[in-house]
């Protein structure tokens, strides 16, 4: 740790405080994440160390690079490449100006490329949200904290006791499915796509049941026809209200037909029928994709 000079605190992630730091030997600017674990008194679990070490091999232009893992004095520090801003901040800064559609399209395309790569290596994110999508001034967007959920779990609250957001959580997780797939990341990305277009969260639930019911009110209450096996899921209740599906043109009105088609496939209830990242990249919505540069208010 003595090789790094902390420049400033840049955020408070799910697992601990995040600093902008400089490598004293190379001058490289990095993001330094101190991981706080419940088990800190007994040290960092060896399983977590193994999981994290595997993530160092995950090299892709749309994945935030894990540069180093520093395990000292029962504490764990993760050294990542540094990017200028997260998507949550960028969307907030764009609340009145909007994010231009070509940039939304570019961001979605890049994120799908990152997901396709990770999913092909059987690595899931599990906790995609605007806060862990990072952008730079050149128009790139990258997935951060990939695989950390498997290593450390997804807590109900952060280390600062903030509630971990449910807004981007797939319905199969909310319904208690223990063995979920890469499709959970596609759902999350679909929610983020809709949010970039409409400038508001698609399903801003404040509890697990509120989250589920917000999804049901928009997409209709799922049944065995649209999602075989749903009624057998651990947290499914036959008493769930039966809401009808809304027309997608009412859900994301500013989005064109291709965009709505892609989004509806990303938000398919049945994880087995939900579009894959690889298939999504071939969707007609991306036939005119470019890579515009964002106007960042840093």
């Amino acid at each position: 740790m003595e090789n790094f000079q902390k420049v400033e605190k840049i955020g408070e992630g799910t697992y601990g405080v995040v600093y902008k730091a400089r490598n004293k030997l190379t001058g490289e600017v990095v993001a330094l994440k101190k991981i706080r674990l419940d088990t800190e008194t007994e040290g960092v679990p060896s399983t977590a160390i193994r999981e994290i070490s595997l993530l160092k091999e995950l090299n892709h232009p749309n994945i935030v690079k894990l540069l180093d893992v520093i395990h000292t004095e029962n504490k764990l520090y993760l050294v990542f490449e540094f990017l200028h801003q997260d998507l949550k901040k960028f969307m907030d800064a764009s609340a009145l100006t909007g994010i231009p559609l070509p940039l939304i399209k570019s961001y979605l395309f890049q994120l799908l490329q990152g997901l396709a790569f990770c999913h092909s290596h059987r690595v899931l994110h599990r906790d995609l949200k605007p806060q862990n999508l990072l952008i730079n001034t050149e128009g790139a967007i990258k997935l951060a904290d990939f695989g950390l959920a498997r290593a450390f779990g997804v807590p109900v609250r952060t280390y600062t006791h903030e509630v971990v957001t449910l807004w981007y959580r797939a319905p199969e997780i909310l319904l208690g499915c223990k063995y979920y797939s890469t499709a959970v990341d596609i759902w999350s990305l679909g929610c983020i796509f809709a949010e970039m277009v409409t400038r508001r969260a698609l399903f801003p639930g404040d509890s697990e049941i509120d989250q589920l019911f917000r999804i049901f009110r928009t997409l209709g209450t799922p049944d065995e026809v649209v999602w075989p096996g749903v009624t057998s899921m651990p947290d499914y209740k036959p008493s769930f209200p039966k809401w009808a599906r809304q027309d997608f043109s009412k859900v994301v009105p500013p989005l064109d037909e291709d965009g709505r088609s892609l989004l509806s496939q990303m938000l398919h209830y049945d994880p087995n029928k939900r579009i894959s990242a690889k298939a999504a990249l071939a969707h007609p919505f991306f036939q005119d994709v470019t890579k515009p540069v964002p106007h960042l208010r840093l």
Epitope: K88, K89, D92, A93, A95, L96, G98, R199, R200
Partner: antibody, heavy 117, light 106 residues
Amino acid sequence: EVQLLESGGGLVQPGGSLRLSCAASGFTFSSYAMSWVRQAPGKGLEWVSGISSYYGYTYYADSVKGRFTISRDNSKNTLYLQMNSLRAEDTAVYYCARVYGYYMDYWGQGTLVTVSS
Amino acid sequence: DIQMTQSPSSLSASVGDRVTITCRASQSISSYLNWYQQKPGKAPKLLIYAASSLQSGVPSRFSGSGSGTDFTLTISSLQPEDFATYYCQQSSSLYTFGQGTKLEIK
């Protein structure tokens, strides 16, 4: 029920200052971007300024840039517009409005600002 | 900056008439176009958002259409309470209002 109540308007001399307030109730104020829109007597609507919800990014129409400052106090559920170096052409009814994504869904009743010597 | 041009600026019509107001943007704004109704001494009221979506509580005689640069607001059968001023507004990038269309009783 969503309510927005503007206050702070009145008569002020050219070059003077005024601070408008907008008290919000009936919704989670901190979750919404907010805007000020004005309407000169007998004229159309003109967007003046806006502020984002979470980080408080601010935006201004060119006509008020450098003279007006928008701010919010989420703990008090209140939106503000500090108006300095006022001109006769700033005379208008000032409305505060809630921004719901990409449209303004709720508006206050307005407060009249008159700039005259 | 995006300019919005509304036409006509004023319009006389009778109860029961079908009325159309048009709005043109100086550049493409996709479907980021909203319509508001304002009565004298009152605050504007949202009618239509995203070019064609009816705001909750607004009568179905109001409808909107268009995409890109050209948009229309249609009132299928005018009611006495519809006589007011109507404004279009783009929200593609910041906000710009049209100059308004005053709908008067013939």
